[in-house]
């Protein structure tokens, strides 16, 4: 049913869903702090533009009695229940921030007449791709897939002279919400990743993974997994690993690699870590002081969601346009706005673009070093280290299939 929006006459409200089920186990107080910090910035920006309006946030809490697992897998109805609550209270803002769980976002999108924009810190799954009024401020699975396919095909770098077309994917079902959907996308038989690879097998048991590490009959030298170094260590321990195995560890929302005193543990030497380029100012910001490096991105996405709304509100008000229109609801895409930590770019479908960084462990210094960066906006890889000190033979990444001849080799003339 149509709910009236508190969104006119110089007063603009943001509805923030504070859900028990969340993509990251972040105390709701920290998210409130992030939202409030965002509001302060937005008010300042609007004032500087000569727009004398009021912007507020209403925090909508779900009923913890019904939805108290804290787990996204059980979140399907929580978002709808919250929307019902909003509807009953006749309290819908100009924009909805949250939910972060893929299941609840998908369900809400399906079951509601979305004449207002929805901004999500999460909703990583492919089922939330290409939604006309949904904006996602944390890298969705589609962006990861495009990087992997691009990297697999690359064969003209000094350190990668073979195209790859095979992979194992380790997925045991205990993953965090982001990893769950990233690996889900890689596993899906209809996904771009599966379409582009000739061979892909999902390993679901620890023992399967451990056996592959030294199996002479393995079908691929490349294993993709998702999580932090500790997760890998629990699985791999100090087991011997064949010299041409490459583990790709997807750990996008973890800044710990970029702390100055970090030394890479020995078990990381056959691993390439895929993470996001760290921000500049987050370490000393007021809202992130209490956050661990892995949680910073989640709170930041809430903050940036507020700044995005402020950006769009400013544009529409300056143009004398109505905020409660489908045009406004569909406008949160194909743009760059000033985020908390610099410019934030959204693609044609409202998904955040970012710079992904592939790190390796230097055998000389035992430090993480940048091998290459990847710009999701242009789907392009940029090599950084032309002579990496790899553990792999000749400081080059091996072929993905042991013993395969040079027919996949890129010849330099």
């Amino acid at each position: 049913s149509q709910v009236s929006q508190n969104c006119h006459n110089g007063s603009y409200e943001i509805s923030v869903l504070m859900m028990g089920n969340s993509a990251f186990a972040e105390p709701l107080k920290n998210l409130e702090d992030a939202v409030n910090e965002g509001l302060e910035i937005v008010r300042g920006r609007l004032q500087n533009a000569g727009l004398n309006v009021t912007v507020n946030a209403t925090f909508m809490y779900s009923d913890g009695l019904i939805h108290n697992s804290g787990d996204c897998r059980s979140s399907t109805c929580e978002g709808l229940d919250l929307l019902r609550k909003i509807s009953n209270a006749q309290r819908m803002g100009c924009v909805l921030i949250g939910p972060s769980c893929t299941y609840s976002t998908f369900q809400m999108y399906l079951d509601t007449e979305l004449s207002y924009p929805m901004i999500s810190a999460g909703s990583f799954g492919l089922s939330c791709d290409y939604k006309e009024t949904l904006t996602r401020l944390m890298s969705p699975a589609r962006k990861l897939m495009y990087f992997l396919v691009n990297f697999w095909k690359t064969n003209d770098l000094p350190f990668k002279t073979y195209s790859w077309s095979t992979s194992y994917v380790y997925k045991n079902g205990t993953e965090t919400e982001d990893c769950f959907w990233y690996l889900n996308a890689l596993e899906a038989s209809v996904s771009y990743f599966s379409h582009e690879l000739g061979f892909k097998v999902v390993l679901r048991q620890d023992k399967e993974f451990q056996d592959i590490l030294m199996d002479h009959n393995r079908k691929s030298n490349v294993i993709i997994m998702c999580g932090g170094p500790e997760f890998l260590y629990k699985l791999k321990g100090d087991r011997a690993v064949a010299e041409d195995i490459v583990i790709i560890l997807v750990d996008l929302f973890n800044d710990q690699y970029f702390e100055d005193n970090v030394t890479a543990p020995d078990y990381m030497k056959n691993v390439l870590v895929l993470t996001l380029s760290p921000g500049n100012s987050l370490l000393n910001s007021s809202f992130s002081r209490n956050l661990s490096p892995t949680k910073r991105d989640f709170a930041l996405a809430y903050l940036n969601g507020i700044l995005l709304f402020g950006h769009m509100l400013k544009i529409f008000l300056e143009n004398g346009e109505n905020i409660t229109t489908p045009k406004f609801a569909h406008a949160f895409r194909n743009l760059t706005f000033e985020g908390y930590d610099g410019p934030v770019t959204l693609d044609d479908w409202g998904d955040v673009d970012s710079t992904m960084v592939l790190l390796y462990t230097s055998v000389d210094t035992k430090k993480y070093k940048v091998l290459l960066t990847y710009d999701t906006h242009v789907n392009k890889t940029y090599p950084v280290d032309m002579s990496p000190t790899f553990t792999w033979k000749n400081s080059k990444l091996p072929n993905d299939i042991t013993g395969r001849g040079p027919q996949h080799h890129h010849h330099h003339h």
């Epitope: 970029f258 100055d260 380029s277 760290p278 960084v357 230097s362 000389d364 210094t365 430090k367 993480y368 070093k369 940048v370 091998l371 960066t373 940029y382 950084v384 280290d385």
Partner: nanobody, 123 residues
Framework: QLQLVESGGGLVQPGGSLRLSCVTS????????IGWFRQAPGKEREGVIC???????KYADSVKGRFTISRDNAKNTVYLRMDSLKPDDTAVYYC?????????????????WGQGTQVTVSS
Amino acid sequence: QLQLVESGGGLVQPGGSLRLSCVTSGFTLDDYAIGWFRQAPGKEREGVICLTSGGLPKYADSVKGRFTISRDNAKNTVYLRMDSLKPDDTAVYYCAASGATSRWNCPPQYDHWGQGTQVTVSS
């Protein structure tokens, strides 16, 4: 002693590309942050790109998506690849080095400078 020598500049048409090289000696690239700067006639010198000692590139907004930086430790060389060049990119380009206090941040100032190489973008 520590030295930086730039090369690769020249005259290029708008939309064209160039690759500048900065050959270093007297230090290890792993221990230094390298910055590329430029100075156009009558203007202040401005930072274009920096590569932290850990290898993280940081770009000025004006060149993001057009310029990229890479390094080859085996050749003691840092490269600046410039694509989609515009007349506004015309300047003398300098590379500079600073002993890294942080592996992932660009230093506030640089201690060692090359002599520069001229880049002219004109039709």
